[in-house]
Protein backbone atom coordinates (compact mmCIF):
# COMPACT_ATOMS: atom_id res chain seq x y z
CA UNK A 1 0.00 0.00 0.00
CA UNK A 2 1.33 3.40 -1.02
CA UNK A 3 0.31 6.93 -1.97
CA UNK A 4 -1.31 7.23 -5.40
CA UNK A 5 0.78 7.62 -8.55
CA UNK A 6 0.83 10.92 -10.41
CA UNK A 7 -2.25 11.42 -12.61
CA UNK A 8 -1.93 12.96 -16.09
CA UNK A 9 -4.49 15.03 -17.97
CA UNK A 10 -4.07 13.60 -21.45
CA UNK A 11 -6.87 15.13 -23.51
CA UNK A 12 -9.29 18.05 -23.63
CA UNK A 13 -11.82 18.55 -26.41
CA UNK A 14 -14.63 20.95 -27.28
CA UNK A 15 -17.26 20.28 -29.94
CA UNK A 16 -18.09 23.94 -30.48
CA UNK A 17 -16.08 26.37 -28.27
CA UNK A 18 -19.11 26.50 -25.97
CA UNK A 19 -18.47 23.48 -23.75
CA UNK A 20 -15.46 21.23 -23.21
CA UNK A 21 -14.28 18.08 -21.46
CA UNK A 22 -10.90 17.05 -20.08
CA UNK A 23 -9.90 13.45 -19.37
CA UNK A 24 -7.11 12.13 -17.17
CA UNK A 25 -5.17 8.92 -16.71
CA UNK A 26 -5.31 8.10 -13.00
CA UNK A 27 -1.91 6.49 -12.45
CA UNK A 28 -1.60 3.75 -9.81
CA UNK A 29 -4.00 3.80 -6.87
CA UNK A 30 -1.40 2.46 -4.44
CA UNK A 31 -3.67 -0.51 -3.71
CA UNK A 32 -6.14 1.70 -1.86
CA UNK A 33 -9.42 3.46 -2.64
CA UNK A 34 -8.35 6.71 -4.28
CA UNK A 35 -10.30 9.91 -4.87
CA UNK A 36 -9.59 12.21 -7.80
CA UNK A 37 -10.42 15.88 -7.95
CA UNK A 38 -9.85 18.29 -10.81
CA UNK A 39 -9.22 21.92 -9.99
CA UNK A 40 -8.68 24.85 -12.30
CA UNK A 41 -7.95 28.54 -12.36
CA UNK A 42 -7.98 31.00 -15.22
CA UNK A 43 -4.99 33.10 -16.19
CA UNK A 44 -4.92 36.41 -14.44
CA UNK A 45 -7.35 35.24 -11.74
CA UNK A 46 -6.44 34.17 -8.22
CA UNK A 47 -9.45 31.94 -7.51
CA UNK A 48 -9.24 28.18 -7.89
CA UNK A 49 -12.37 26.13 -8.63
CA UNK A 50 -13.29 22.48 -8.57
CA UNK A 51 -14.61 20.60 -11.60
CA UNK A 52 -18.28 21.47 -12.07
CA UNK A 53 -19.35 18.05 -13.44
CA UNK A 54 -17.55 14.72 -13.03
CA UNK A 55 -20.42 12.64 -14.46
CA UNK A 56 -21.46 13.81 -17.93
CA UNK A 57 -18.37 12.69 -19.86
CA UNK A 58 -17.77 9.42 -18.02
CA UNK A 59 -15.02 8.14 -15.71
CA UNK A 60 -11.89 10.20 -15.08
CA UNK A 61 -13.32 13.25 -16.79
CA UNK A 62 -14.56 16.74 -16.12
CA UNK A 63 -17.24 18.39 -18.23
CA UNK A 64 -17.40 22.19 -18.42
CA UNK A 65 -20.86 23.30 -19.47
CA UNK A 66 -21.58 26.63 -21.17
CA UNK A 67 -21.66 28.53 -17.91
CA UNK A 68 -18.12 27.37 -17.02
CA UNK A 69 -16.57 27.80 -20.46
CA UNK A 70 -14.74 31.01 -21.37
CA UNK A 71 -12.92 31.63 -24.59
CA UNK A 72 -9.77 33.72 -24.96
CA UNK A 73 -8.85 32.73 -21.40
CA UNK A 74 -6.26 30.09 -20.61
CA UNK A 75 -7.37 27.51 -18.05
CA UNK A 76 -4.71 26.06 -15.77
CA UNK A 77 -5.97 22.60 -14.84
CA UNK A 78 -4.63 20.02 -12.40
CA UNK A 79 -5.85 16.68 -11.09
CA UNK A 80 -5.19 15.61 -7.52
CA UNK A 81 -5.24 11.96 -6.41
CA UNK A 82 -5.70 11.20 -2.70
CA UNK A 83 -5.78 8.03 -0.64
CA UNK A 84 -5.16 7.36 3.06
CA UNK A 85 -1.40 7.08 2.46
CA UNK A 86 -1.00 10.45 0.77
CA UNK A 87 -1.67 12.44 -2.38
CA UNK A 88 -0.22 13.23 -5.77
CA UNK A 89 -0.88 16.06 -8.23
CA UNK A 90 -0.62 16.10 -12.01
CA UNK A 91 1.48 18.59 -13.91
CA UNK A 92 -0.71 21.60 -14.73
CA UNK A 93 -2.27 21.59 -18.18
CA UNK A 94 -2.74 24.95 -19.88
CA UNK A 95 -5.87 24.93 -22.03
CA UNK A 96 -7.25 27.51 -24.44
CA UNK A 97 -10.72 26.34 -25.52
CA UNK A 98 -10.34 27.89 -28.96
CA UNK A 99 -7.52 25.42 -29.66
CA UNK A 100 -9.23 22.17 -28.64
CA UNK A 101 -12.24 22.07 -30.95
CA UNK A 102 -13.02 18.70 -32.49
CA UNK A 103 -16.14 19.33 -34.55
CA UNK A 104 -18.81 17.01 -35.86
CA UNK A 105 -18.13 15.83 -39.44
CA UNK A 106 -19.42 17.81 -42.42
CA UNK A 107 -23.02 17.07 -43.42
CA UNK A 108 -25.16 16.74 -46.54
CA UNK A 109 -22.51 14.96 -48.57
CA UNK A 110 -23.71 14.73 -52.18
CA UNK A 111 -22.09 12.88 -55.07
CA UNK A 112 -22.81 13.54 -58.73
CA UNK A 113 -21.21 12.22 -61.89
CA UNK A 114 -20.74 15.02 -64.41
CA UNK A 115 -19.24 15.34 -67.85
CA UNK A 116 -17.08 18.02 -69.42
CA UNK A 117 -17.51 19.24 -72.98
CA UNK A 118 -14.71 16.92 -74.08
CA UNK A 119 -16.77 13.97 -72.74
CA UNK A 120 -14.40 13.49 -69.83
CA UNK A 121 -16.35 12.42 -66.74
CA UNK A 122 -15.68 13.44 -63.18
CA UNK A 123 -17.21 13.00 -59.75
CA UNK A 124 -18.49 16.21 -58.20
CA UNK A 125 -18.39 15.97 -54.40
CA UNK A 126 -20.21 18.61 -52.33
CA UNK A 127 -20.92 19.00 -48.61
CA UNK A 128 -21.91 21.49 -45.93
CA UNK A 129 -20.05 22.50 -42.76
CA UNK A 130 -21.17 20.81 -39.53
CA UNK A 131 -24.39 22.22 -38.10
CA UNK A 132 -22.93 23.74 -34.96
CA UNK A 133 -20.30 25.82 -36.68
CA UNK A 134 -21.04 29.37 -37.63
CA UNK A 135 -18.63 29.52 -40.55
CA UNK A 136 -20.29 32.53 -42.21
CA UNK A 137 -19.43 34.90 -39.36
CA UNK A 138 -15.84 33.70 -39.20
CA UNK A 139 -16.45 32.20 -35.77
CA UNK A 140 -15.00 29.05 -37.31
CA UNK A 141 -12.70 28.70 -40.29
CA UNK A 142 -12.87 25.11 -41.49
CA UNK A 143 -10.51 23.09 -43.64
CA UNK A 144 -11.72 19.89 -45.26
CA UNK A 145 -10.49 16.58 -46.55
CA UNK A 146 -12.33 14.05 -48.65
CA UNK A 147 -11.35 10.45 -49.08
CA UNK A 148 -12.54 8.00 -51.65
CA UNK A 149 -11.83 4.47 -52.80
CA UNK A 150 -13.33 1.95 -55.15
CA UNK A 151 -15.11 -0.92 -53.42
CA UNK A 152 -12.32 -3.30 -54.40
CA UNK A 153 -9.45 -1.08 -53.24
CA UNK A 154 -7.74 -1.40 -49.86
CA UNK A 155 -6.32 2.13 -49.68
CA UNK A 156 -8.20 5.41 -49.46
CA UNK A 157 -7.17 8.27 -51.72
CA UNK A 158 -7.20 11.51 -49.68
CA UNK A 159 -7.65 15.01 -51.10
CA UNK A 160 -7.18 18.16 -49.03
CA UNK A 161 -9.66 20.78 -50.25
CA UNK A 162 -8.71 23.76 -48.08
CA UNK A 163 -11.76 25.89 -47.26
CA UNK A 164 -13.70 24.65 -50.30
CA UNK A 165 -16.89 22.68 -49.68
CA UNK A 166 -16.78 20.99 -53.06
CA UNK A 167 -14.25 19.00 -55.03
CA UNK A 168 -13.98 17.43 -58.48
CA UNK A 169 -12.37 14.00 -58.79
CA UNK A 170 -11.14 12.95 -62.21
CA UNK A 171 -9.67 9.72 -63.62
CA UNK A 172 -12.20 7.36 -62.10
CA UNK A 173 -12.85 3.94 -63.60
CA UNK A 174 -16.22 3.45 -65.35
CA UNK A 175 -18.27 0.60 -63.93
CA UNK A 176 -16.66 0.93 -60.50
CA UNK A 177 -18.51 1.79 -57.32
CA UNK A 178 -16.75 4.44 -55.19
CA UNK A 179 -17.09 5.18 -51.49
CA UNK A 180 -16.64 8.78 -50.31
CA UNK A 181 -16.30 10.43 -46.89
CA UNK A 182 -15.44 13.92 -45.66
CA UNK A 183 -13.98 15.38 -42.48
CA UNK A 184 -13.19 18.89 -41.25
CA UNK A 185 -10.74 20.71 -39.04
CA UNK A 186 -11.09 24.18 -37.54
CA UNK A 187 -8.17 26.59 -37.23
CA UNK A 188 -5.87 25.33 -34.46
CA UNK A 189 -8.24 22.44 -33.70
CA UNK A 190 -8.52 18.73 -34.41
CA UNK A 191 -9.86 16.75 -37.33
CA UNK A 192 -13.43 15.53 -36.93
CA UNK A 193 -14.07 11.83 -37.40
CA UNK A 194 -14.81 10.80 -40.97
CA UNK A 195 -18.45 11.44 -41.83
CA UNK A 196 -21.07 9.06 -43.09
CA UNK A 197 -19.98 7.03 -46.09
CA UNK A 198 -21.76 7.67 -49.40
CA UNK A 199 -21.33 5.58 -52.52
CA UNK A 200 -21.83 6.10 -56.24
CA UNK A 201 -21.26 3.99 -59.32
CA UNK A 202 -19.47 5.53 -62.29
CA UNK A 203 -21.55 4.52 -65.33
CA UNK A 204 -19.86 2.66 -68.21
CA UNK A 205 -21.69 4.68 -70.85
CA UNK A 206 -22.25 8.06 -69.28
CA UNK A 207 -24.30 10.46 -71.37
CA UNK A 208 -24.92 14.00 -70.22
CA UNK A 209 -28.56 14.65 -69.30
CA UNK A 210 -30.07 18.05 -70.06
Amino acid sequence: QSPPGKPEIHKCRSPDKETFTCWWNPGSDGGLPTNYSLTYSKEGEKNTYECPDYKTSGPNSCFFSKQYTSIWKIYIITVNATNEMGSSTSDPLYVDVTYIVEPEPPRNLTLEVKQLKDKKTYLWVKWLPPTITDVKTGWFTMEYEIRLKSEEADEWEIHFTGHQTQFKVFDLYPGQKYLVQTRCKPDHGYWSRWGQEKSIEIPNDFTLKD
Partner: antibody, heavy 120, light 107 residues
Protein backbone atom coordinates in the same frame (compact mmCIF):
# COMPACT_ATOMS: atom_id res chain seq x y z
CA UNK B 1 9.42 14.16 -15.39
CA UNK B 2 9.03 15.56 -18.91
CA UNK B 3 12.14 15.07 -21.03
CA UNK B 4 13.00 15.72 -24.66
CA UNK B 5 16.22 13.96 -25.63
CA UNK B 6 17.73 14.82 -29.00
CA UNK B 7 20.16 12.92 -31.21
CA UNK B 8 23.86 13.79 -31.28
CA UNK B 9 25.83 16.42 -33.21
CA UNK B 10 26.15 16.03 -36.99
CA UNK B 11 28.68 17.25 -39.55
CA UNK B 12 27.27 17.41 -43.06
CA UNK B 13 28.40 18.38 -46.55
CA UNK B 14 26.63 21.15 -48.47
CA UNK B 15 23.79 19.74 -50.56
CA UNK B 16 23.20 16.77 -48.26
CA UNK B 17 20.39 16.17 -45.73
CA UNK B 18 20.25 15.77 -41.97
CA UNK B 19 17.61 14.10 -39.81
CA UNK B 20 17.46 15.07 -36.15
CA UNK B 21 15.43 13.05 -33.65
CA UNK B 22 13.73 14.07 -30.42
CA UNK B 23 12.54 11.36 -28.04
CA UNK B 24 9.83 12.47 -25.63
CA UNK B 25 9.11 10.91 -22.25
CA UNK B 26 7.21 11.73 -19.08
CA UNK B 27 3.95 12.68 -20.78
CA UNK B 28 1.45 11.47 -23.40
CA UNK B 29 3.26 12.21 -26.65
CA UNK B 30 0.10 12.76 -28.72
CA UNK B 31 -1.32 15.44 -26.39
CA UNK B 32 0.98 18.32 -27.32
CA UNK B 33 2.25 19.87 -30.54
CA UNK B 34 6.00 19.60 -31.09
CA UNK B 35 7.96 22.51 -32.57
CA UNK B 36 11.40 22.82 -34.10
CA UNK B 37 13.50 25.94 -33.57
CA UNK B 38 17.07 26.65 -34.60
CA UNK B 39 19.77 28.99 -33.36
CA UNK B 40 22.79 29.88 -35.47
CA UNK B 41 26.05 30.44 -33.52
CA UNK B 42 25.74 33.62 -31.44
CA UNK B 43 22.38 34.42 -33.03
CA UNK B 44 18.69 34.53 -32.14
CA UNK B 45 16.03 31.87 -32.41
CA UNK B 46 14.23 30.92 -35.63
CA UNK B 47 11.06 28.81 -35.78
CA UNK B 48 11.09 26.05 -38.41
CA UNK B 49 7.70 24.40 -37.98
CA UNK B 50 5.32 22.43 -35.77
CA UNK B 51 3.63 19.04 -35.87
CA UNK B 52 0.66 17.55 -34.05
CA UNK B 53 1.76 14.03 -33.10
CA UNK B 54 -1.84 12.83 -32.83
CA UNK B 55 -2.39 13.04 -36.60
CA UNK B 56 0.91 14.35 -38.07
CA UNK B 57 -0.73 17.59 -39.19
CA UNK B 58 2.04 20.16 -39.61
CA UNK B 59 2.66 23.84 -40.27
CA UNK B 60 5.93 25.25 -41.58
CA UNK B 61 7.71 28.55 -41.70
CA UNK B 62 7.54 29.37 -45.44
CA UNK B 63 11.29 29.89 -45.38
CA UNK B 64 11.75 26.15 -44.70
CA UNK B 65 8.66 24.75 -46.45
CA UNK B 66 10.55 23.22 -49.38
CA UNK B 67 13.46 21.85 -47.35
CA UNK B 68 12.15 20.81 -43.93
CA UNK B 69 10.05 17.73 -43.23
CA UNK B 70 8.58 17.05 -39.81
CA UNK B 71 7.46 13.54 -38.89
CA UNK B 72 6.64 11.55 -35.77
CA UNK B 73 6.76 7.93 -34.73
CA UNK B 74 4.01 7.49 -32.17
CA UNK B 75 5.17 3.98 -31.25
CA UNK B 76 8.46 5.35 -29.89
CA UNK B 77 7.23 8.86 -28.92
CA UNK B 78 9.84 10.37 -31.21
CA UNK B 79 9.66 13.46 -33.40
CA UNK B 80 11.96 14.01 -36.37
CA UNK B 81 13.09 17.02 -38.34
CA UNK B 82 14.77 16.46 -41.69
CA UNK B 83 16.42 19.36 -43.50
CA UNK B 84 17.58 18.86 -47.08
CA UNK B 85 19.81 20.75 -49.53
CA UNK B 86 21.99 21.93 -46.67
CA UNK B 87 24.11 25.04 -47.01
CA UNK B 88 26.69 26.61 -44.73
CA UNK B 89 24.13 29.05 -43.28
CA UNK B 90 22.17 26.07 -41.91
CA UNK B 91 24.94 25.54 -39.35
CA UNK B 92 23.05 25.92 -36.08
CA UNK B 93 21.82 24.24 -32.94
CA UNK B 94 18.44 22.65 -33.69
CA UNK B 95 15.96 22.33 -30.82
CA UNK B 96 12.71 20.45 -30.46
CA UNK B 97 10.31 22.20 -28.10
CA UNK B 98 7.00 21.04 -26.70
CA UNK B 99 3.97 23.28 -26.80
CA UNK B 100 3.16 24.80 -23.42
CA UNK B 101 -0.37 23.42 -23.35
CA UNK B 102 -3.44 22.87 -25.47
CA UNK B 103 -3.34 26.34 -26.85
CA UNK B 104 -1.08 28.95 -28.36
CA UNK B 105 2.49 28.29 -29.43
CA UNK B 106 4.68 29.01 -26.46
CA UNK B 107 7.25 26.43 -25.54
CA UNK B 108 7.52 25.04 -22.02
CA UNK B 109 9.97 22.17 -22.55
CA UNK B 110 13.00 22.13 -24.82
CA UNK B 111 15.38 19.41 -25.95
CA UNK B 112 19.07 19.86 -25.18
CA UNK B 113 19.76 20.87 -28.79
CA UNK B 114 21.59 19.19 -31.68
CA UNK B 115 24.48 21.01 -33.31
CA UNK B 116 24.44 20.59 -37.09
CA UNK B 117 27.59 21.80 -38.83
CA UNK B 118 27.51 22.18 -42.60
CA UNK B 119 30.98 22.34 -44.05
CA UNK B 120 32.77 21.18 -47.17
CA UNK C 1 6.37 38.02 -41.12
CA UNK C 2 6.04 39.90 -37.84
CA UNK C 3 9.37 41.38 -36.71
CA UNK C 4 10.09 41.45 -32.99
CA UNK C 5 12.64 44.15 -32.20
CA UNK C 6 14.28 43.89 -28.80
CA UNK C 7 16.20 46.60 -27.03
CA UNK C 8 18.74 47.04 -25.72
CA UNK C 9 20.83 44.26 -27.25
CA UNK C 10 22.80 44.12 -24.01
CA UNK C 11 22.61 45.68 -20.58
CA UNK C 12 25.10 45.74 -17.70
CA UNK C 13 23.61 45.61 -14.24
CA UNK C 14 24.37 44.66 -10.66
CA UNK C 15 22.66 42.27 -8.28
CA UNK C 16 19.58 43.99 -6.81
CA UNK C 17 19.11 46.30 -9.82
CA UNK C 18 15.82 46.70 -11.63
CA UNK C 19 16.25 45.69 -15.28
CA UNK C 20 13.85 46.50 -18.09
CA UNK C 21 13.90 44.92 -21.56
CA UNK C 22 11.56 46.02 -24.32
CA UNK C 23 10.20 44.22 -27.33
CA UNK C 24 8.36 45.94 -30.17
CA UNK C 25 6.24 44.00 -32.66
CA UNK C 26 6.05 45.26 -36.25
CA UNK C 27 2.28 44.75 -36.18
CA UNK C 28 -0.48 44.15 -33.64
CA UNK C 29 -0.08 40.87 -31.72
CA UNK C 30 -2.54 41.41 -28.87
CA UNK C 31 -1.14 39.61 -25.84
CA UNK C 32 0.32 36.71 -27.84
CA UNK C 33 3.84 37.15 -26.52
CA UNK C 34 6.14 34.89 -24.50
CA UNK C 35 9.51 35.56 -22.88
CA UNK C 36 12.40 33.10 -22.50
CA UNK C 37 15.68 33.06 -20.61
CA UNK C 38 18.74 31.34 -22.08
CA UNK C 39 22.09 30.70 -20.44
CA UNK C 40 25.23 29.91 -22.47
CA UNK C 41 25.22 26.36 -23.85
CA UNK C 42 21.72 25.70 -22.51
CA UNK C 43 18.23 25.52 -23.97
CA UNK C 44 15.83 28.44 -23.55
CA UNK C 45 13.51 28.40 -20.53
CA UNK C 46 9.96 29.78 -20.56
CA UNK C 47 9.33 32.69 -18.19
CA UNK C 48 6.15 34.46 -19.30
CA UNK C 49 3.25 33.58 -21.64
CA UNK C 50 0.23 35.58 -22.82
CA UNK C 51 2.22 38.78 -22.27
CA UNK C 52 1.79 38.89 -18.51
CA UNK C 53 1.40 35.43 -17.02
CA UNK C 54 4.32 33.85 -15.21
CA UNK C 55 4.86 30.21 -16.08
CA UNK C 56 4.79 27.62 -13.28
CA UNK C 57 7.74 28.00 -10.92
CA UNK C 58 8.99 31.32 -12.32
CA UNK C 59 9.90 33.78 -9.54
CA UNK C 60 7.66 36.80 -9.01
CA UNK C 61 10.53 39.22 -9.70
CA UNK C 62 9.88 38.55 -13.42
CA UNK C 63 6.93 40.45 -14.83
CA UNK C 64 5.70 41.72 -18.16
CA UNK C 65 3.48 44.54 -19.17
CA UNK C 66 2.11 45.60 -22.49
CA UNK C 67 -0.21 44.52 -25.26
CA UNK C 68 -0.67 45.34 -28.91
CA UNK C 69 2.83 46.12 -30.17
CA UNK C 70 4.90 47.16 -27.14
CA UNK C 71 6.02 44.78 -24.41
CA UNK C 72 8.34 45.13 -21.45
CA UNK C 73 9.99 42.41 -19.38
CA UNK C 74 10.99 43.66 -15.95
CA UNK C 75 13.27 41.94 -13.45
CA UNK C 76 12.48 43.82 -10.27
CA UNK C 77 15.59 42.85 -8.31
CA UNK C 78 18.30 41.12 -10.30
CA UNK C 79 19.67 37.92 -8.78
CA UNK C 80 23.00 36.23 -9.64
CA UNK C 81 21.17 33.46 -11.53
CA UNK C 82 19.41 36.02 -13.76
CA UNK C 83 22.51 36.89 -15.80
CA UNK C 84 21.52 35.43 -19.16
CA UNK C 85 20.08 36.30 -22.55
CA UNK C 86 16.35 37.03 -22.82
CA UNK C 87 14.19 36.54 -25.92
CA UNK C 88 10.63 37.61 -26.68
CA UNK C 89 8.43 35.61 -29.06
CA UNK C 90 5.14 36.34 -30.78
CA UNK C 91 2.58 33.63 -31.48
CA UNK C 92 -0.11 35.82 -32.98
CA UNK C 93 0.45 34.82 -36.60
CA UNK C 94 2.58 32.42 -38.60
CA UNK C 95 5.48 32.10 -38.67
CA UNK C 96 6.13 32.41 -34.94
CA UNK C 97 9.04 34.82 -34.56
CA UNK C 98 11.53 35.78 -31.86
CA UNK C 99 13.30 38.97 -30.91
CA UNK C 100 17.06 39.18 -31.41
CA UNK C 101 17.77 38.79 -27.72
CA UNK C 102 18.99 40.97 -24.84
CA UNK C 103 22.08 39.92 -22.93
CA UNK C 104 22.04 40.86 -19.25
CA UNK C 105 25.66 41.07 -18.07
CA UNK C 106 27.33 41.69 -14.73
CA UNK C 107 28.46 45.29 -14.32
Amino acid sequence: EVQLVQSGAEVKKPGSSVKVSCKASGYTFTTYWMHWVRQAPGQGLEWIGEIDPSDSYSNYNQKFKDRATLTVDKSTSTAYMELSSLRSEDTAVYYCARNGGLGPAWFSYWGQGTLVTVSS
Amino acid sequence: DIQMTQSPSSVSASVGDRVTITCKASQYVGTAVAWYQQKPGKSPKLLIYSASNRYTGVPSRFSDSGSGTDFTLTISSLQPEDFATYFCQQYSSYPWTFGGGTKVEIK
